[in-house]
Interface confidence: low
Amino acid sequence: DITPSVPPASYHPKPWLGAQPATVVTPGVNVTLRCRAPQPAWRFGLFKPGEIAPLLFRDVSSELAEFFLEEVTPAQGGIYRCCYRRPDWGPGVWSQPSDVLELLVTEELPRPSLVALPGPVVGPGANVSLRCAGRLRNMSFVLYREGVAAPLQYRHSAQPWADFTLLGARAPGTYSCYYHTPSAPYVLSQRSEVLVISWEGEGPEARPASSAPGMQAPGPPPSDPGAQAPSLSSFRPRGLVLQPLLPQTQDSWDPAPPPSDPGV
């Protein structure tokens, strides 16, 4: 009954699989995986790669089944798919599997890189783009400048990177970036190494972020536009719910909200 035998795609179309509150969470968070079928189903199965039997199943006579993962651990991270079936399909017949959902359970996201495009040396009047590149899509990226406590720019990106444009005349300086999940419960990356942007004729240098004087460590997105980003140590307690960052510089902030979860 639980060995998935997948018929042609047109026969039993695939369901949609989503995660609440997010696909990237810190350990200890309760995660709900929602499997939504395009037609009423009776049994839903949650599968992991290499397993022929469902990790979990739910008997629900509707289009939606919820799988509850309580206080997730990093070991529960990984790739999930869901399928649905009706008993009249015959033994072991499941729908086409959903697209993969990758659940990442981590205390901290990998450190991003920060590079200058076309390069860290700026000619008079020329603009420069700073690319903060992480490894995950649909993240919110934050750019800091040494000596400025509040984030300089903020971008949500569907790509695993975000580009920040600096006007040439104001570009020289020391920069750092980090990224975080776009909604609570927030998971933050380590901060990138600093990047020095200089005028032509002055040599750039890279320094470890920790040695950049006057630059705040990235904080959780403050709810108050005037709030300063606190240091990392002030927001690491597990389970703390953080508030979204509001834009500091309206002209450089991308106000498009993250894609909404169709399962909500």
């Epitope: 009423p40 006579s61 009249d88």
Partner: antibody, heavy 117, light 106 residues
């Protein structure tokens, strides 16, 4: 052998409340959708409530919605039906059933509810 | 709500006679299920998914139909087949039963 044993029926005044229980054995209770079905004195069968295997989802017809609550205790292999604001038309034999797909495949012996003043 | 209408309400048949009872549905469904209830006992699943016989059901019983029209047939009536037969749809909420066909021995 699958066995479903209902209990808790009796005589109740209109507006009163009663809780029915169904003890299940012979199968993995926590893996099955369960339902209550009643049979009126005129021998009509009426679906009353359904609950998903984990208890997260419940379904009712309009005739009992807001008055009846189906629940389950998977640790005790027991299904419940809490009935309140009872009416004379709720008088029936109440059967606990196991869902075997799109239909109840096993039924208990039933317990009788009489609503009368 | 999907209303199931059974006909006839009561019928009688002689031993060996072919018996057919029908169940019509107010809106199309994928599968019909049938229950048998003998006097003073609980209903029993008899035919499921339109045409599949439940465990222990004699081969003289068959089910057929699609859309809004379904039927249960006994190829050769026997005394033990005396009972009330109910059709049931589990395809959509609210789940509904027919009023039953009472089969008697002539």
């Amino acid at each position: 052998d699958v066995k479903l044993v209902e209990s808790g029926g009796g005589l109740v005044k209109p507006g009163g409340s009663l809780k029915l229980s169904c003890a299940a054995s012979g199968f993995t209770f926590s893996s099955y959708v369960m339902s209550w079905v009643r049979q009126t004195p005129e021998k009509r069968l009426e679906w009353v409530a359904t609950i998903s295997s984990g208890g997260s989802y419940t379904y009712y017809p309009d005739s009992v919605k807001g008055r009846f609550t189906i629940s389950r205790d998977n640790a005790k292999n027991t299904l419940y039906l809490q009935m309140s604001s009872l009416k004379s038309e709720d008088t029936a034999m109440y059967y606990c059933t196991r869902e075997g797909g799109n239909s109840p495949d096993y039924w208990g012996q039933g317990t009788t509810l009489t609503v009368s003043s | 709500e999907n209303v199931l209408t059974q006909s006839p309400a009561i019928m009688s048949a002689s031993p060996g006679e072919k018996v057919t009872m029908t169940c019509s549905v107010s809106s199309s469904i994928s599968y019909m299920h049938w229950y048998r209830q003998k006097s003073f006992t609980s209903p029993q699943l008899w035919i499921y998914d339109t045409s599949k016989l439940a465990s222990g059901v004699p081969g003289r019983f068959s089910g057929s139909g699609s859309g809004i029209s379904y039927s249960l047939t006994i190829s050769s009536m026997e005394a033990e087949d005396v009972a009330t037969y109910y059709c049931f749809q589990g395809s959509e909420y609210p789940l509904t039963f027919g009023a039953g066909t009472k089969l008697e021995l002539k």
